[in-house]
């Protein structure tokens, strides 16, 4: 079952999935000046059996026949209106990611791919958060959010993460507004862009992908 909305946003933080549950869809988006080939897939789908999971379909982009100055928008699956976006990153694999049953790795980039990836997550998906550059976490350990189904509705758990400016000592941070502030994003954007710097995921985090080392939600 697809998650109804985006993972929660945390001020001065970004999120990333370490692996994608079967059923996850990734839109085939092309960068400006390119489009999906006519017979090409709308999205890639994480599928598999008990022993192996992989992405079905391939995304392919071709040069647009006419120069298009507006951003190319790929049609989205009808069941899902919300957009989950992550900025393109070099693929990163925690130590035991491949051994996670029922999960796909980060798909490799395709030629002329858009700079943002739009995922449609499914129930049970876990995403990890970290503070953006220049900010530090007040909590220890991985901060994660899980898409859960409760009373027939999906919701993301709230991650335990508070990011504060490193330069601000012995006072409440935020007196000077750094670039990393969420103020910089239009209010209409509900998706969280992950920065191009790869997450530094400790082995401890990788080893606890399905079982957090601390409670993300108390209540």
């Amino acid at each position: 079952e697809l998650c109804d909305d985006d993972p929660p946003e945390i001020p001065h933080a970004t999120f990333k999935a370490m692996a994608y549950k079967e059923g996850t869809m990734l839109n085939c988006e092309c960068k400006r000046g390119f489009r999906r080939i006519k017979s090409g897939s709308l999205y890639m789908l994480c599928t598999g059996n008990s022993s192996h999971s992989s992405w079905d379909n391939q995304c392919q982009c071709t040069s647009s026949a006419t120069r298009n100055t507006t951003k190319q928008v790929t049609p989205q699956p009808e069941e899902q209106k919300e957009r989950k976006t992550t900025e393109m990153q070099s693929p990163m694999q925690p130590v035991d990611q491949a051994s996670l049953p029922g999960h796909c790795r980060e798909p490799p980039p395709w030629e002329n791919e858009a700079t943002e990836r739009i995922y449609h997550f499914v129930v049970g998906q876990m995403v990890y958060y970290q503070c953006v550059q220049g900010y530090r976490a007040l909590h220890r350990g991985p901060a994660e959010s899980v898409c859960k189904m409760t009373h027939g509705k999906t919701r993301w758990t709230q991650p335990q993460l508070i990011c504060t400016g490193e330069m601000e000592t012995s006072q409440f941070p935020g007196e000077e507004k750094p670039q990393a502030s969420p103020e910089g994003r239009p209010e209409s954007e509900t998706s969280c862009l992950v920065t191009t710097t790869d997450f530094q995921i400790q082995t401890e985090m990788a080893a606890t992908m399905e079982t957090s080392i601390f409670t993300t939600e108390y209540q």
Partner: antibody, heavy 116, light 107 residues
Framework: QVQLVESGGGVVQPGRSLRLSCAAS????????MAWVRQAPGKGLEWVAV????????YYADSVKGRFTISRDNSQNTLYLQMNSLRAEDTAVYYC?????????WGQGTLVTVSS | DIQMTQSPSSLSASVGDRVTITCRAS??????LNWYQQKPGKAPRRLIY???SLQSGVPSRFSGSGSGTDYTLTISSLQPEDFATYYC?????????FGQGTKLEIK
């Protein structure tokens, strides 16, 4: 079950000091940021101080900066608030809180009255 | 600091009424806004986080909306247990700040 129990409140004269404690249980105390929030009688809520999981980062409201010190003892699962040079306007119920991003768990509060 | 202003300061309503409380920030808080309920002698309880996400265990009659500087808490059908004081709180930038509160009383 998260439990936070504040103690140390009472009546104190202006200019004097008081130390509040908060005993925590039911969660991994050493992993989490903690905070003190206060509420003057019949008034609203105010964040007083916040401390990171390891005590390396401390943040204070302007109204208490230089007078109050937040600290923690992870081996004892205890949060502290050292309040010096107390003023009448510091009179409030002081709450210890955690779960700062997940709904907040609060203690029952301890009343501090600054009066001559 | 970001100032949070709630309106009205107090409100009389009856069981079954639909009630709306508004909160205005002195600058954009980018939807990083919580709503709390507090009853006399008790600690606050968070109802809504991130403008519109319902805290686990909170009845669905509570809902939140808004963006930029203007936010709203709506109780679709007041229940006897809903009479309390409600606070908004921004967590977009430190110091996190609360509104002054809205006292919801029985008419």
């Amino acid at each position: 079950q998260v439990q936070l129990v504040e103690s140390g409140g009472g009546v104190v004269q202006p200019g004097r000091s008081l130390r509040l404690s908060c005993a925590a249980s039911g969660f991994t105390f050493s992993n989490h940021a903690m905070a003190w929030v206060r509420q003057a009688p019949g008034k609203g809520l105010e964040w007083v101080a916040v401390i990171s999981y390891d005590g390396s980062n401390k943040y204070y409201a302007d109204s208490v900066k230089g007078r109050f010190t937040i600290s923690r003892d992870n081996s004892q699962n205890t949060l502290y608030l050292q309040m010096n040079s107390l003023r009448a306007e510091d009179t409030a119920v002081y709450y210890c809180t955690t779960g700062l991003n997940s709904g907040y768990d609060w203690g029952q509060g301890t009343l501090v009255t600054v009066s001559s | 600091d970001i100032q949070m202003t709630q309106s009205p300061s107090s409100l009389s309503a009856s069981v079954g009424d639909r009630v709306t409380i508004t909160c205005r920030a002195s600058q954009s808080v980018s939807k990083f806004l919580n709503w709390y309920q507090q009853k006399p002698g008790k600690a606050p309880r968070r109802l809504i986080y991130g403008t519109n996400s319902l805290q686990s265990g909170v009845p669905s009659r509570f809902s939140g909306s808004g963006s930029g500087t203007d936010y709203t808490l709506t109780i679709s059908s007041l229940q006897p247990e809903d009479f309390a004081t409600y606070y908004c709180q921004q967590y977009n930038s430190w110091p996190w700040t609360f509104g002054q509160g809205t006292k919801l009383e029985i008419k």
